[in-house]
């Protein structure tokens, strides 16, 4: 019978937003199949996505466990079973991944301005607080639940009729600031973990909202 | 080369059970993935049922519900048990264990057969 080797895997790469996290890797497999392990660093290696023709796996169920914990996994490459190979009595391939550790490094999805509302000379906008696959007691926690004051919101304002930007910060999910009567603004927020010095530091800035559309209410 | 021993087929009834089992000549290293195979009179080689060192299985479709697959690693043994036995569940069953390699055995007769 023939001996069809298997070969490893490469790039292996993590994939993760707001704790969902996938790892990714290549080839796309001909007679062969993969199966990933996860595993911290202290503990045993546990199978996922087993017996899988996929180049990715979620292992958002695992690492959701401990998001402080530091991650490794590996993904091992079988023979397909219809291969029909003998040879010898050899481990199969595998390549480790990166180490991960999900709290330093998920990347912080783009936020949504959930709504802002005018009183007179000041304006409330609310950010709305994303949830996560993390549970505590069997409750999913949001991302600020998990991040606490490590996770700041940036927002960006400016007039309706002009470019300069303002910025405001907040260590909550609500800012107040003061605009001119009269006038309408924009909004944009952005996520940032300023103790975070990498390039997931920041998130995408999220949808512009103007005042005098649906989400704003105005009262005098 | 490792050497993989089947035992436990035979004919049974329909709706019956029979309980397959398989010895590795060697140890078999926890990363291994085993399993079994069958092929029907006049068809390829199909995958049944497949487990890890840690016990995750994957199941073909048309098993699943029907057979469970385990496994003892201190016996470097897989074990298939077979419940609800169909006529077209009649094959030869080849356990194997894959490593870098694939390693088979040279497989038990199963009959479903009234």
């Known amino acids: 019978s023939g001996t069809t080797n298997t070969v490893a895997a490469y790039n292996l790469t993590w994939k993760s937003t707001n704790f969902k996290t996938i790892l990714e890797w290549e080839p796309k497999p001909i007679n062969q199949v993969y199966t990933v392990q996860i595993s911290t660093k202290s503990g045993d290696w546990k199978s996922k996505c087993f017996y899988t023709a996929d180049t990715e796996c979620d292992l958002t169920d695992e690492i959701v466990k401990d998001v402080k914990q530091t991650y490794l996994a590996r993904v091992f490459s079988y023979p397909a079973g219809h291969v029909e190979s003998t040879g010898s009595t050899e481990e199969p391939p595998y390549e480790n991944s990166p180490e991960f550790t999900p709290y330093l490094e998920t990347n912080l999805g783009q936020p949504t301005i959930q709504s802002f509302e005018q009183v007179g000379t000041k304006v409330n906008v609310t950010v709305q607080d994303e949830w996560t696959l993390v549970r505590r007691n069997d409750t999913f926690l949001s991302l600020r639940d998990v991040f606490g004051k490590d996770l700041i919101y940036t927002l960006y304002y400016w007039k309706s009729s002009s470019s300069g930007k303002k910025t405001a910060k907040t260590n909550t999910n609500e800012f107040l600031i003061d605009v001119d009567k009269g006038e309408n603004y924009c909004f944009s927020v952005q996520a940032v973990i300023p103790s975070r010095r990498t390039a997931n530091r920041k998130s995408t800035d999220s949808p512009v909202e103007c005042m005098g559309h649906e989400k704003g209410e105005s009262r005098e | 080369q490792v050497q993989l021993v089947e035992s436990g087929g035979g004919l049974v009834q329909p709706g019956g059970s029979l309980r397959l089992s398989c010895t590795a000549s060697e140890t078999i290293s926890s990363t291994y993935i085993m399993g079994w195979h069958r092929q029907a009179p006049g068809k390829g080689l199909e995958l049944v049922a497949v487990?890890?060192?840690?016990?995750?299985?994957h199941y073909a479709d048309f098993v699943k519900g029907r057979f469970t697959i385990s496994r003892d690693n201190a016996k470097n043994a897989v074990y298939l048990q077979m419940n609800f036995l169909r006529a077209e569940d009649t094959a030869v069953y080849y356990c194997y264990a894959a490593g870098r390699w694939n390693h088979w055995g040279q497989g038990t007769m199963v009959t479903v057969s009234s």
């Open positions: 487990i890890s060192g840690d016990g995750v299985t």
